[in-house]
Structures are given as C-alpha cells and as structure tokens.
Interface confidence: medium
C-alpha cells in the first residue's frame, strides 16, 4: 500500500575536521521510493556537485573534504506524492586545528616607540595565542600585551625587548607554532663622553676624546671649525656597542672641534655632538687675537665695492676667513640681482662692509663697523620695500644657518658718526648731497618718501642730518 | 697659453691607493681657486673635490669625504688629489679645473684633458 | 641632498631654438645657486659656456645664453648650429648642503 514518508533517523549536529570527510545520514520509510533533496543553508546541492557523493538512493550525503567555509545547516527534504514531504535538518560544525594566517615577520624598531608583532590565527575551537622570548614564555605586563587578534604590542620599546620571538596558538584539536622571528631594537646615537677645551702653547700636542653609543655602533668623524678634519690622526675603538675615538692634534691655531656621532636608521640618522675649544695661551702671531686680524681684501666679490687695498677684519672662527667671508657675501651677492636699481649698489656696499669691515690695526686689530646713519640711510630710503622682505625673512628662519652673518645688521645698534667720527666706516658709494640723486636711477615719483640725510663726504668734517636721522 | 695637464691615473684594485696631479701653466696659480671633477663611463659629470687659491679649506663630495684628500703647492703650481681606500665605483676620468676666482665655488672657465682611474679586481 | 634634475635628451632643428632646463628636486633655483652651464661633445674635455645665471664665458658666441625662469635655471640656444649637438649640464652651487657644487645629469642635444 502507499505509504507517506517517514525520516526515521533524523540529522544530527556532524562535527568534522577541514580535509575530512562528513557524511548526514537520512533514512527514510516510504511507498513508493521518495525522492530526497540536500540542502545547505537553504541553497540547494546540485546532484552533480563535485564535492559532495549522494548515495543510497540519497539518505546519505557525504562532503568528501571538509572546507572550513561547509559549515553550516544541512537538510534532507523526502517526497513520494503521498502526503506532504517530510524534512530534518542538522549542523555541521567545522573543526579546525590552529593555523597562523599571518606569521609575525622580523621588526627593527627605534627605542622608546611602539612594536607590533602580527599574529593572526585560524582554527575552531577558536585557538588562544602566547607568546615565546627566547626559550621562555613571554609574560605581560603593563608595556606588553597580546592583543585580541593574536599580535603582541610592546610600548616604549626597551633594549631588553630584543630578541627572538615565536606565538604559538592552541585549541582542543592542536598546537601550533610561528617561525621565530628577531625583534632589533635601534638606539639613537648618544655621545657618553664629550671631547674637553684646553688652552695650550702653541705647536703642542693634545688629544680629544669623544666616547659614543646607539644601535648600530655609531660611526665618529670631528669637524674642525665648519670643515672636515683636514689633520690630525684618529685612533678608534668599539667594544661593547660603545666607540671610542681620539684625535690627535699638533696645535698652530685656535679652533673648535666637534665630534659628531652618526648612526643609520632604515633611510634615516640620528646624530649626537659635542663640541670643545682649543684655545692658545699667548696667542699672539703678528696682526693676530684670537678673533681675528687685518689683512689687505683679495678677494673678488666686493672689488668694485671697496676701496683699493682696504685694509678689512678677518675673523679667526672660521678656519679660513677670507675663504669663508668671500663665500658668505658670494652667496648673498646674487639675491641682491633681484632688488630694485635703487636699492642694488647701496645693499651691495652695505653687504660688502659688513660681512669684510674696515680694520683698524694696532696691537688689538679692531672691526669698524658701518655708521649708523649709513645703515639707515639703506634700510629706509634706498631698500626700504627689501629691508622689510629681508627682516621677515630673517624673523621667520627663512636664512639658512650659515648665512647668520647675512642678516641684515640692526641699525639701532650701530655707532652714529655724531659719537666719534673714527669709531664708524662710511659707505663711501652713499657719500652725496640731496640734490646729487642723479648719480642714482630715479625713483618712480620725482620726489623720495624720505628725508634723505645729508651724509658727509670722505673729505668732509661737518656731520650734519635730517632730524629724521639725529641720534640722541 | 693656459694648461692644465692631469696625470697619475690607472689600474688600481679595491681598497688601493692613487695620487693624481695637476700641473697648471700659463696663469697665475696662486690666483684661482681649483677643483677636480669626474666622469664615470658614459656617465654624467660630478664634481668631487675644490680648493681655494689658498688651500685653506678642502671640500669633498659626501661619498669620498675621509677618502680623498685635496690639496695644492703653489709654488711648484700643481694640484692634488689624494685617494685612498678606492671603491669599484670611483672608476671615471678625473678632470682638474680652474675656477673662475679666488673662492672654492663656482664656474669652471679651465679644464685638463683627463686622466682614467680605473678601479678593478 | 637635494637632486639636480635635467631634460635627458632634446633636439632642435639647424637655425631652430631650443631651451634646456635646470631644476631642483626640492625647491627652487635661484640666482644664489650661481647656474653654470658646460658644454661636452664625445671624446673631449667640458667648456664653460654660461657662469652665475647669465655671463658668458670668453669666446662662447652670443646665441648661447642663460636665464631664470619660474623655478628653474635655463640655457636657450637660439640660431642652433650642427656643431652645438652635444652634452649639456648645469651645475648648481648649493650653500647650505654642505658647501656642495651639484652637476645635473645632463642633457644629449640633438641638431636635426
């Protein structure tokens, strides 16, 4: 007799392991045979489907391989056309062992940043993640956490954070573990013993020394006086991640050494420095102190400007003055290309004046600075617009740090020729009266927005200014 | 007639040392700033190394500073450049040239024809 | 250190003119950077044509000559002749990078 269908052992929760095989059993009493569908998550499996083997007339359905993306609701629907059809359903739960998606990979980082080891798992039962220093487990703390994901955070990274890490993840089913992986902790370049200032006698012998450290080892190298060490023998030695470098001088001059300490971080150094001053005890080569002496200009930017073989001040800070002061006005000369006609030949004498001042010779060879009244006459007739373009400039850091000289000079803090005629220079190329304007190109109103003062000739004794330009 | 005639080049292994010279005629030495400058094979221009008329200071190139030492004697009117500790990348024609002034920077009005460095194991 | 950046290569016809550039690759050329411009043909020595921006050196003819323009150093040759094909290169003075003089990579000049 027709008999409706009946599944007599309904589907049961299956768990399985991914690559192995999971079979739903449905049997089902019927008359006449039923037909019998799978299901997975409502979708329904294609008979020809690859992965699945449906046998027994369809009351088993067998994954041949378990992915962990199978898991899911399985349900076998039985039809024979008598009464309705009758359905069970049951669960797959996969089952995986750990397995470490995305390994920890090997990290250098800088003292005192953040370090983030990954470690990224896989598995079910969900696996727990620790972690391995060394041959030891790895214990948090207020600076290392392992976070949810699996990945070990360590803030403010120490020395003694370095070293060889692995994670390990486990479940019921398993354990596993990461390759080991190398956390190098870089350390700025820091200088542990700075080189000492000595004054001595000239032609002696002295040794500065200068200790420094970081990860890597840094490297050393002494400048002397703005340039590379040009004499001098080095001596170094590392030990302990601590290098030690000493250099040896034979002393014919003052100077100021520095020791630099550089090391490599990826694309990028970290330097330290330390600088000491060798000063000579009775320095007293003819025209020579210690800050500088008076020579005759040779050089080949200010020709036009100064007076034939002026006697100008070469300062001894710099290893070489009358290389380092031509360079100094030969890279500011060009910016004056661009100012105004006007404003060109009384910046260029200015500039010049400045940067090689008049030297007064004596036992105490002596700079003479510019007048007053000169600056002014610069700063706020002929340059006024550029005056302010340059002081923004300077105020803004827009000079770089060698051209410091090149700032413009402050006026205010100049000597006015009222004070002492002698103790000031005289911009020669400024020298004019009012009304002989024409040996300069003429402004675009016929009339000048300042007074301008009445600066004396070379020649002449009488000091007499506007009132805009009287120095009390 | 101005001159300047560089020598002391050839064939040196890594780590070895050469002294190149440049002989200067026909201006006054003691004048000019000087400097020497490179060319790799088929390669562009790249300057190295300069001097004042004085040879007070020296300035070099980062990647030869602590290697190569410049230096000058204006009495016999020859230039120098000291290399030392050569690396398979300094092999070029080395060129000495006059600057146009007294200062370590700017144009070069002067050359020599060249001398090869050739750094080879 | 900042790069000196130059076309690689550019041509021109005979009585054409052709300008070659000269930047940098942070910032701008100015008259501070002191442009100089040299001139190489195969198998000889460089010649100074342009100094500081604009001056021609002795014996360079007038169809050569140099400018600032934007941000850039620039060489025009106007009237180019045959004998002009050859390398190019500008040079720059760079101050605050370590007292450096900086060559570009050049510019191969071809006289069509």
């Known amino acids: 007799l027709p008999k409706a269908p009946v599944i007599t052992t309904p589907l049961e929760t299956v768990d399985a392991l991914v690559e192995e095989v999971a079979t739903f059993m449905c049997a089902v009493e019927s008359y006449p045979q039923p037909e019998i569908s799978w299901t997975r998550n409502k979708i329904l499996i294609k008979l020809f489907d690859t992965r699945y083997s449906i046998r027994e007339n369809g009351q088993l359905l067998t994954i041949l391989s378990v992915e962990d993306s199978d898991d899911g609701i399985y349900c076998c629907t039985a039809n024979n056309g008598v009464g309705g059809a009758v359905e069970s359903c049951g669960a797959l739960q996969v089952k995986m062992k750990p397995k470490i998606t995305r390994p920890p990979i090997n990290v250098k980082i800088i003292e005192g940043l953040k370090a983030v080891l990954p470690c990224t798992t896989m598995g079910n039962p969900k696996p727990s993640v620790s972690w391995i220093k060394g041959d030891s487990p790895l214990r948090e703390n207020s600076r290392i956490a392992v976070l949810e994901s699996g990945s070990l955070r360590i803030h403010n990274v120490q020395k003694e954070d370095a070293g060889q890490y692995r994670c390990v993840a486990k479940n019921s089913l398993g354990t596993a573990y990461s390759k080991v992986v190398k956390l190098e902790v870089e350390v700025f370049a820091r200088i542990l013993r700075a080189p000492e200032s000595h004054n001595v006698t000239f032609g002696s012998f002295v040794t500065l020394h200068c200790t420094a450290t970081g990860i890597p080892v840094p490297t050393i190298t002494w400048i002397e006086n703005g340039n590379a060490v040009s004499s001098g023998s080095i001596q170094e030695s590392v030990k302990d991640r601590v290098i030690d470098s000493r250099l040896q001088l034979f002393i014919t001059k003052p100077g100021l050494y520095t020791c630099i300490a550089t090391n490599k971080h990826g694309e990028k150094f970290s330097t330290a420095k330390a600088a000491a001053t060798i000063s000579i005890a009775e320095w007293s080569k003819p025209q020579k102190d210690n800050k500088g002496y008076c020579a005759q200009y040779r050089g080949e930017v200010c020709n036009a400007v100064l007076a034939k073989d002026a006697l100008v001040f070469l300062n001894t800070s710099y290893a070489d003055p009358e290389e380092a002061q031509e360079l100094l006005v030969h890279t500011a000369w060009n910016e004056l290309k661009v100012v105004s006609p006007v404003c060109r030949p009384a910046a260029e004498a200015l500039l010049c004046n400045h940067i090689f001042q008049e030297c007064s010779p004596g036992v105490v060879p002596t700079p003479i600075p510019i007048c007053r009244e000169y600056c002014l006459a610069v700063k706020e007739l002929f340059c006024a617009k550029e005056w302010l373009v340059m002081e923004e400039k300077t105020h803004r850091g827009l000079y770089r740090s060698e051209m410091h000289l090149l700032s413009v000079p402050e006026c205010s803090k100049l000597p006015s020729m009222h004070w002492d005629p002698t103790a000031c220079a005289r911009l020669p190329h400024l020298d004019y009266n009012k009304e002989n304007l024409k040996t300069f190109p003429p402004m675009t109103s016929s009339k000048p927005s300042v007074d301008i003062p009445n600066l004396p000739s070379s020649s002449s004794s009488s000091f007499s200014v506007s009132p805009t330009y009287s120095m009390t | 007639e101005l001159q300047l005639v560089e020598s002391g080049g050839g064939l040196v292994q890594p780590g070895g040392s050469l002294r190149l010279s440049c002989a200067a005629s026909g201006f006054t030495f003691d004048d000019y700033g000087m400097s020497w400058v490179r060319q790799a094979p088929g390669k562009g221009l790249e300057w190295v190394s300069a001097i004042p008329w004085n040879g007070g200071s020296t300035y070099y190139k980062e990647s030869v500073k602590g290697r190569f030492t410049i230096s000058r004697d204006n009495a016999k009117k020859t230039l120098y450049l000291q290399m030392n500790s050569l690396k398979s990348e300094d092999t070029a024609v080395y060129y000495c040239?006059?600057?146009?002034?007294?200062?370590?920077?700017?144009?070069?009005?002067?050359w020599g024809q060249g001398t090869l460095v050739t750094v080879s194991s | 250190q900042a790069v000196v950046t130059q076309e690689p290569s550019l041509s021109v016809s005979p009585g054409g003119t052709v300008t070659l550039t000269c930047g940098l690759s942070?910032?701008?050329?100015?008259?501070?950077?002191?442009p100089d411009w040299y001139q190489q043909t195969p198998g000889q020595a460089p010649r100074g044509l342009i100094y500081?921006?604009?001056s021609r050196h002795s014996g360079v003819p007038s169809r050569f000559s140099g400018s600032i323009s934007g941000n850039k150093a620039a060489l025009t040759i106007t009237g180019a002749q045959p004998e002009d094909e050859a390398d190019y290169y500008c040079?720059?003075?760079?101050?605050?990078?370590?007292?450096?003089?900086?060559f570009g990579g050049g510019t191969k000049l071809t006289v069509l």
């Open positions: 942070s910032g701008s050329v100015t008259a501070s950077n002191y």
């Open positions: 040079a720059l003075y760079m101050y605050s990078d370590s007292k450096l003089y900086v």
């Open positions: 500081s921006t604009d």
């Open positions: 040239a006059k600057r146009s002034g007294r200062i370590a920077f700017g144009a070069l009005d002067a």
